[in-house]
């Protein structure tokens, strides 16, 4: 392995998965590397093989149990190491003492559905997936709506500063096709980041009735 610029980032999904990405400039694509997890107060150790996701980055998931099982708590510390094979030995390339609830990234929201649609309005709901009960209501959401002729990047962000799993989109254009996405973030954790965006939900507003506006 070469001593290029390295980065090792991991996130806990709040239940039973730690996802890690390891990148190193100039590293060989066929280098064999793995992430090893060593908790301070659990009986298990876990390893996952880092698989290439781009020219200089690798990723893997430490699956700690059933998807909805609560495998770690706020007091856990998991020492994470990147180990890469160099000849007959393994070399430690990165190491961190990982506090799961300081490094959260939840799963993308699921089950998006149109509850009610009108000419200018649409009410949409969703669910959060594999989120810890520890959060209670301490979550926030961001949503965006894709209008015709625009890109997702141009879409203004709507912020929901509470655990609200629905939104009423207003000032929409009648008889128009839209797409909608939402993402979630716990309020807890210094290095916590937004979940991936949900799968887009396509919907169409109702056409305006002749002679009146509903």
């Amino acid at each position: 392995a070469v001593n290029g610029t390295s980065q090792f980032t991991c996130f806990y999904n709040s239940r039973a998965n730690i996802s890690c990405v390891w990148s190193q400039d100039g590293a060989l694509q066929d280098t064999s590397c793995q992430v090893h997890a060593w908790p301070d107060r659990r009986r298990w150790n876990q390893t996952c093989e880092l698989l290439p996701v781009s020219q200089a980055s690798w990723a893997c998931n430490l699956i700690l149990g059933a998807p909805d099982s609560q495998k770690l708590t706020t007091v856990d510390i998991v020492t994470l190491r990147v180990l890469c094979r160099e000849g007959v030995r393994w070399r430690v390339m990165a190491i961190q003492d990982f506090k799961p609830f300081e490094n959260l990234r939840l799963m993308a929201p699921i089950s998006l559905q149109v509850v009610h649609v009108e000419t200018h309005r649409c009410n949409i709901s969703w669910e959060i997936s594999q989120a810890s009960h520890y959060f209670e209501r301490h979550l926030e959401f961001e949503a965006r709506t894709l209008s015709p002729g625009h890109t997702w990047e141009e879409a203004p962000l709507l912020t929901l500063k509470q655990k609200q799993e629905w939104i009423c989109l207003e000032t929409l254009t009648p008889d128009t096709q839209y797409e909608f996405q939402v993402r979630v973030k716990p309020l807890q954790g210094e290095f916590t980041t937004w979940s991936p965006w949900s799968q887009p939900l396509a919907f169409r507003t109702k056409p305006a009735a002749l002679g009146k506006d509903t």
């Epitope: 392995a1 001593n3 610029t5 390295s6 090792f8 980032t9 060593w38 301070d40 510390i77 020492t79 190491r81 070399r91 430690v92 390339m93 990165a94 190491i95 961190q96 003492d97 990982f98 506090k99 300081e102 490094n103 210094e190 290095f191």
Partner: nanobody, 126 residues
Amino acid sequence: QVQLVESGGGLVQAGGSLRLSCAASGFTFSNYAMSWVRQAPGKGLEWVSSITGFGRGTDYADSVKGRFTISRDNAKNTLYLQMNSLKPEDTAVYYCARYSSSTYYPPTPARGTDYRGQGTQVTVSS
């Protein structure tokens, strides 16, 4: 704002011991890996040792391995370097440094720090 203040340096005879301390403030200490680096007179910065956020991982430069011990007390927001069997070539200004995240990279341990203290002078006489 992030502050790192070293103390514990001084003049000591070869074979003696010193314990350096680094008081940290302005950030959640346990969330960051830390290190000690040193600068001898007329030389560049030399990495000495690194430690993970809860002390479960440590690394040392070959020149100090077996003589120096890095540790931390997260309740006191303090990093330590216990220096035993000191040699004249250990004479330097010693700095504590914070890595920019909870991670450090053993093959390139001098990289990735974002804050450093003002340093404390260690002089080892023969």
